[in-house]
C-alpha cells in the first residue's frame, strides 16, 4: 500500500494548563523506519516526540505504538505553556545505510494555538 | 539495571503442558513489547512470540500457532508462554527478551530449559 | 532465511567482520547477538543495524545496505571469541528470523 502520512485537524486550540492530542495515521509502515514529532520546519524545526524509546517530558504517545500493526501515531501533549504554540509536523522517515535516516513524508501539519488560561 | 528472570522450566512427557514465566524488573515493563525465543540443544536461535506492551496483539511463528499461547501481566511485569501438547522437538532453552522500538532485542534473560521426554 | 558465514577467524588486534544476507532492506531492521557458550544467556551488540548498547564496547559496530547487514569488530580481543547470530525483524510479515551463526575464533 503507498504510504501516507494524514493529520487530519488543520488546527487545534488548547487553554493554557491543559492537554491537547495531535493526530497523525499512516497508510503503511513501510519503508521501515522511524515517525517523529517535530515543531516547525526546516533548519531551526524542533524535535518534540520519537517513537523510538526515548522518554519526553510531557509528550507521550496515544496509541500503543508496539503493536507490529501500528499505524497510529498521534501524542498527547501535556500542561501546555504558550511556549508550545507553532505548527507541528508528523513526519515518517527511512532507515539510512548511514546517519541520517531519511526524511519520505510529512503530514500537513497542525497548528496549536494556546489560549489564555480562563480566570 | 533491567533484569529478566525465567521459571517454569523443566522435564515433561510428550503431549503434555508447561507454562513458563519470566519476572522482570528494572525497566517501565509495561512500556515494552515482549517475545519468546528458543534454542535447542546445540541449534541456533529460533524466535516463538511475540506480544505488544499492552498485551492486546500477540504474533507467532508459524509452527507454534494455535499450540503456544503468550501473555503478559503488567501490574506483576511478568511474561508468560503457555506451551500444550509438547513433543521432543520443543526441548530447547527458552528466553524471554525485551523487544526495542523496531521490535528486535535488546536484553535477554538467562533462559530456562525445557526437555520433553518419555 | 538469513544467511551467515559459519565461522571466521582473526589474530588479536585484528578489524573482523563478519556479514548476514537474505533481508529486504526496504522492510528489515538488523541486529547482532553475542552467545559466549551454548545455551547462555544473548548479549545484544548491536541493534537497528547500526546501534550499539551504552554498555557494549565501541570496538563493535554494524552498517546495513542493499540486502545484507555487516557486523564489524575493530581491534578484536580474546573475549570476544563467541558465536555471534545475525536477527532480522521483517516489517512485511511482523516476523523475527536468525541466521545460524557465526563462530568467531580468535587466535
Known amino acids: 500500500k503507498e504510504l501516507k502520512v494524514t493529520q487530519p485537524e488543520k488546527s487545534v486550540s488548547v487553554a493554557a494548563g491543559d492537554s491537547t492530542v495531535l493526530n497523525c495515521t499512516l497508510t503503511s509502515l513501510l519503508p521501515v523506519g522511524p515517525i517523529k514529532w517535530y515543531r516547525g520546519v526546516g533548519q531551526s524545526r524542533l524535535l518534540i516526540y520519537s517513537f523510538t524509546g526515548e522518554h519526553f517530558p510531557r509528550v507521550t504517545n496515544v496509541s500503543d505504538a508496539t503493536k507490529r500493526n501500528n499505524m497510529d501515531f498521534s501524542i498527547r501533549i501535556s500542561n501546555v505553556t504558550p511556549e508550545d504554540a507553532g505548527t507541528y509536523y508528523c513526519v515518517k522517515f527511512q532507515k539510512g545505510p548511514s546517519e541520517p535516516d531519511t526524511e519520505i513524508q510529512s503530514g500537513g501539519g497542525t497548528e496549536v494555538y494556546v489560549l489564555a488560561k480562563p480566570s | 539495571d533491567v533484569q529478566l528472570v525465567e521459571s517454569g522450566g523443566g522435564v515433561v512427557r510428550p503431549g503434555e503442558s508447561l507454562r513458563l514465566s519470566c519476572a522482570a524488573s528494572g525497566f517501565t515493563f509495561s512500556s515494552h513489547a515482549m517475545s519468546w525465543v528458543r534454542q535447542a540443544p546445540g541449534k541456533g536461535l529460533e524466535w516463538l512470540a511475540g506480544?505488544?506492551?499492552?498485551?492486546?496483539?500477540?504474533y507467532y511463528i508459524d509452527s507454534v500457532k494455535g499450540r503456544f499461547t503468550i501473555s503478559r501481566d503488567n501490574s506483576k511485569s511478568s511474561l508468560y508462554l503457555r506451551m500444550n501438547s509438547l513433543t521432543a522437538e520443543d526441548t530447547a532453552v527458552y528466553y524471554c527478551?525485551?523487544?526495542?522500538?523496531?521490535?528486535?532485542?535488546?536484553?535477554w534473560g538467562l533462559g530456562t530449559l525445557v526437555t520433553v521426554s518419555s | 532465511a538469513l544467511t551467515q558465514p559459519a565461522s571466521v577467524s582473526a589474530n588479536p588486534g585484528e578489524t573482523v567482520k563478519i556479514t548476514c544476507s537474505g533481508g529486504d532492506y526496504y522492510s528489515t531492521y538488523y541486529a547482532w547477538y553475542q552467545q559466549k557458550s551454548p545455551g547462555s544467556a544473548p548479549v545484544t551488540v548491536i541493534?537497528?543495524?547500526?546501534e550499539r548498547p551504552s554498555d557494549i564496547p565501541s570496538r563493535f559496530s554494524g552498517s546495513a545496505s542493499g540486502s545484507a547487514a555487516t557486523l564489524i569488530i575493530t581491534g578484536v580481543r580474546v573475549e570476544d571469541e563467541a558465536v555471534y547470530f545475525c536477527?532480522?525483524?521483517?516489517?512485511?510479515?511482523?516476523?523475527?528470523?536468525f541466521g545460524a551463526g557465526t563462530t568467531l575464533t580468535v587466535l
Open positions: 541493534h537497528s543495524d547500526d
Open positions: 527478551a525485551r523487544e526495542t522500538w523496531n521490535h528486535l532485542f535488546d536484553y
Open positions: 536477527g532480522g525483524y521483517d516489517g512485511r510479515t511482523y516476523i523475527n528470523t
Open positions: 506480544i505488544s506492551a499492552g498485551g492486546s496483539d500477540t
